[in-house]
């Protein structure tokens, strides 16, 4: 049975021209990770593989870092940014857990940031 | 280099089995999941089986389930697959093959070929 | 099972043509889906992952697009070479399932 949660920054909103980070946590499952998939709507962003490490897909190398974490930062923002993104973990074995993100990108220099969420 | 050589192919009555082998050099094997591909005769690709990197997760197709057990030993860098109660439709290609991050195959062997015929 | 659906199964094109093979899932894939590359006799050879990246060491005409349920190989200038045939996959969930093929034939 999969017992596990996936808490997440939930929504958050940037500046253009700024960065973020996107961060999932994975609780309340003693599941091992084997990997962790970032996805922006249909696109695969970057995958964090437990035994080769990070990938970040060649189109957003310049955009995209890996980390902190098992996380992931969002560079040089644009509008175009806005949208959902999903963290997907794949566990052994339970199995796969996904998390959403909706974040917001703004012209305005006065964009609100949700609370800034932290892996203890 | 990354090379995949499979091994254990031939001729075999139904109902006989056969166990490939797939010897893997040139990168850390433990790390990678790994695939069984095979192609009947003149016909396209077929995904059999696969491993993750540790040996703990298995999936196979629906035509081999029960029939074929994929399996690995990461001190000898080689990967397996045992086929039992095999059948005519069995007959293929059999190709070793590498899956990064479980999303795509860099790394075909250059197969070996399995017939099932009396 | 995603059910996979290549088109066309084959095609006649001469060197320096452009050539566009189409991909259909019968659900939605996100961009999980992969492009390879066959020719008689040998194993296949990846050429586009994750729908829209070149594999490394593959020539630049090649490129890939698509998301969801459709997607597209494009041969931007057919060399000989290229005579082969191309099988899509996707690996969004298991069973791993590919495409029919399309031959790409000299016309």
């Known amino acids: 049975m999969m017992t596990g949660t996936i808490e997440t920054t939930g929504n958050i909103s940037a500046e253009k021209g700024g960065s973020i980070i996107l961060q999932c946590h994975l609780s309340s499952t003693t599941a091992q990770v084997t990997q962790v998939n970032w996805e922006q709507q249909d696109q695969l962003l970057a995958i964090c593989n437990a035994d080769l490490g990070w990938h970040i897909s060649p189109s957003f190398k310049d955009r995209v870092a890996p980390g902190p974490g098992l996380g992931l930062t969002l560079q040089s923002l644009t509008v175009n940014d806005t949208g959902e993104y999903f963290c997907i973990y794949h566990t052994y074995p339970d199995g796969t857990y996904t998390g959403r993100i909706f974040l917001e990108v703004l012209e305005s220099s006065v964009a609100e940031h949700g609370a800034r969420f932290q892996i203890p | 280099e990354v090379q995949l050589l499979e091994s254990g192919g031939g001729l075999v009555q139904p109902g006989g089995s056969l166990r490939l082998s797939c010897a893997a050099s040139?990168?850390?094997?433990?790390?990678?999941?790994m695939h069984w591909v095979r192609q009947a005769p003149g016909k396209g690709l077929e995904w059999v089986a696969s491993?993750?990197?540790?040996?703990?997760?298995?999936s196979y197709a629906d035509s081999v389930k029960g029939r074929f057990t994929i399996s690995r030993d990461n001190s000898k860098n080689t990967l397996y697959l045992q086929m039992n109660s095999l059948r005519a439709e069995d007959t293929a290609v059999y190709y070793c093959?590498?899956?990064?991050?479980?999303?795509?195959?860099?790394?075909w062997g250059q197969g070996t070929l399995v017939t099932v015929s009396s | 099972d995603i059910q996979m659906t290549q088109s066309p199964s084959s095609l006649s094109a001469s060197v320096g043509d452009r050539v566009t093979i189409t991909c259909r899932a019968s659900?939605?894939?996100?961009?999980?889906l992969n492009w390879y590359q066959q020719k008689p006799g040998k194993a296949p050879k990846l050429l586009i992952y994750a729908a829209s990246s070149l594999q490394s060491g593959v020539p630049s005409r090649f490129s890939g697009s698509g998301s969801g349920t459709d997607f597209t190989l494009t041969i931007s200038s057919l060399q000989p070479e290229d005579f082969a045939t191309y099988y899509c996959q996707q690996s969004y969930s298991t069973p791993l399932t590919f495409g029919g093929g399309t031959k790409v034939e000299i016309k």
């Open positions: 093959a590498r899956g990064p991050y479980d999303v795509w195959i860099d790394y």
């Open positions: 659900q939605s894939i996100s961009s999980y």
């Open positions: 040139g990168f850390t094997f433990s790390s990678y999941s």
């Open positions: 491993i993750k990197s540790s040996g703990g997760y298995k």
